[in-house]
Amino acid sequence: LIQERRSHEVNPAAHLTGANSSLTGSGGPLLWETQLGLAFLRGLSYHDGALVVTKAGYYYIYSKVQLGGVGCPLGLASTITHGLYKRTPRYPEELELLVSQQSPCGRATSSSRVWWDSSFLGGVVHLEAGEKVVVRVLDERLVRLRDGTRSYFGAFMV
Amino acid sequence: LIQERRSHEVNPAAHLTGANSSLTGSGGPLLWETQLGLAFLRGLSYHDGALVVTKAGYYYIYSKVQLGGVGCPLGLASTITHGLYKRTPRYPEELELLVSQQSPCGRATSSSRVWWDSSFLGGVVHLEAGEKVVVRVLDERLVRLRDGTRSYFGAFMV
Amino acid sequence: LIQERRSHEVNPAAHLTGANSSLTGSGGPLLWETQLGLAFLRGLSYHDGALVVTKAGYYYIYSKVQLGGVGCPLGLASTITHGLYKRTPRYPEELELLVSQQSPCGRATSSSRVWWDSSFLGGVVHLEAGEKVVVRVLDERLVRLRDGTRSYFGAFMV
């Protein structure tokens, strides 16, 4: 597969930021701000939490989520999974692209039950036009949103 | 905003590395090595800890800091904040771009009070010519410098 | 050093994924899948765990490893080192490029002995044709492979 980047074309890129509406509690992917503040779309589009590819190629995709809590809730698995997943018209289920598992609540200390952790993912994947990439966090209740700088999702063609 | 990357132009990029002088203790940003070893500047400049943009565009900016300590010092907050911040002539205060909070000292174990942790940040932001990006770590006393491979700061145009 | 990226040339990129054969136990670098699933090579080659540069330039190189264990090693340093290293014909020893140290097993909690952690590294380095980049993890016994999405290694020219 040969991919050329012609000098007169804009290089697709996007950076989406966390917002109060990001966490739906519905079991769906995280939702993102696309326009305000640091967020932008250039040569990519957005739909229901997904970055939608308009031009096929290799993309560096990335996401960071800010995690935080108080102690280790017994009702929660101590494992948090943060992943980037692909949705393609050619396959009925989401495909895992880049995934991390973390056990952040063990970070609570003897002097403080509050803990913070951050998960970063990034890597190059091939995406066809029309394919979508989403971010999921299980358990999303531990994602801490604030101002778009701590949890985000982006991509650019390489 | 349309940004073209012409084939005869060099693509701005930089990678700055941690050095003994990085931690000033003055409340300012971290300082960086720009020439020795792995460090370089190409189409970007440097001033007092800041990467200075000479060509406007979208940049993937990144930083990693190596954290370490012995136990959880009571005099320190158990939360460490690592962030990339923008300084612009159009606004008097620094703007948060990408930020992480971590509670690393909970990683000390029963058999060892020594702990290590690493914080990585990366994302795409739009930067105008003359704007500056800096790295801050609070509390910077927990940043562990060695040889430029463990704490660093870089960017490249996308 | 001036580097041009001509529009008719393909931009070198690669993403290699973790596989059952990645962990050799021999003290060598991790080995990687280069073709199946999400893995690919484009303008870079591969040999014995190494990405081999065919075209000199500045590359953003990255790696993530998924770590996991049960409790903490007794009497051992609980530190894990994850790094990207360069092999060059001009120098007999590997050179550290990007390195992280983590103490993940302190993440085990009172209710769960199992812990998970992830280490991500990424940064821009200059590589000459024929130079090689490898990933090492010490102690590699704590790397948890599954399906190529949790531990990986890649690069692209910037």
């Epitope: - | - | 049960v70 409790g71 007794l74 009497g75 002995r113 102690d139 948890r144």
Partner: antibody
Framework: QIQLLQSGPELEKPGETVKISCKAS????????MNWVKQAPGKGLKWMGW????????TYADDFKGRFAFSLETSASTAYLQINNLKNEDTATYFC????????????WGQGTSVTVSS | DIVLTQSPKFMSTSVGDRVSITCKAS??????VAWYQQKPGHSPKLLLY???TRHTGVPDRFTGSGSGTDFTLTISNVQSEDLADYFC?????????FGAGTKLELK
């Protein structure tokens, strides 16, 4: 190669005390915890607890608190299980098993020591 | 305590068959499950850990799957030397617990 060698079978009367040994070889003894597991005749496996071979700190499962004691002779790479005030229901085979922190569970087991309690 | 419910208790098979043993945990144990084989008069032998990773020297006819609460050990192409008791074991939370066992015997 890694081996756990346990002491031989024991025939004891109720009320007596027995001490079983488990000698490790082929690895650094103090880097891995040691579990003790009971298997009554014709029954399944029951975890009794473990001892931190680095610190010497024992942890006992609820059913094995009181009459049971784990100890070490680190210089000899040996772990011990002592059962005091033996009862008929202590009749079983007792296994030591290495606790592997990289997630293998109990990866190496001793051959077992049969303890018979009979008056 | 986490209870591991293993089924069936007994399984009759023939050489060459494919058999599956299930283990259900009363709480989420992540993938911290091991499977052991025990022959009469011998100590248990580790087959699989992390639910699906084969221990050194274990034939590839032994496979494991599952995470959370439901786990399966499958033996494809059963050999006569596979006739034994099989136990699942969770090592993710204290107290560590075992399933009651499954006896694999010839028809």
């Amino acid at each position: 190669q890694i081996q756990l060698l346990q002491s031989g079978p024991e025939l004891e009367k109720p009320g007596e005390t027995v001490k079983i040994s488990c000698k490790a070889s082929g690895y650094t003894f103090t880097n891995y915890g040691m579990n003790w597991v009971k298997q009554a005749p014709g029954k399944g496996l029951k975890w009794m607890g473990w001892i931190n071979t680095y610190t010497g700190e024992p942890t006992y499962a609820d059913d094995f608190k009181g009459r049971f004691a784990f100890s070490l002779e680190t210089s000899a790479s040996t772990a011990y299980l002592q059962i005091n005030n033996l009862k008929n229901e202590d009749t079983a085979t007792y296994f030591c098993a290495r606790d592997n922190w990289d997630g293998k569970g109990m990866d190496y087991w001793g051959q077992g020591t049969s303890v018979t309690v009979s008056s | 305590d986490i209870v591991l419910t293993q089924s069936p208790k007994f399984m009759s098979t023939s050489v060459g068959d494919r058999v599956s043993i299930t283990c259900k945990a009363s709480q989420d144990v992540d993938t911290a499950v091991a499977w052991y084989q025990q022959k009469p008069g011998h100590s248990p032998k580790l087959l699989l850990y992390w639910a699906s990773t084969r221990h050194t020297g274990v034939p590839d006819r032994f496979t494991g799957s599952g995470s959370g609460t439901d786990f399966t050990l499958t033996i494809s192409n059963v050999q006569s030397e596979d006739l034994a008791d099989y136990f699942c074991h969770q090592y993710g939370s204290y107290p560590l617990t075992f399933g009651a066992g499954t006896k694999l015997e010839l028809k």
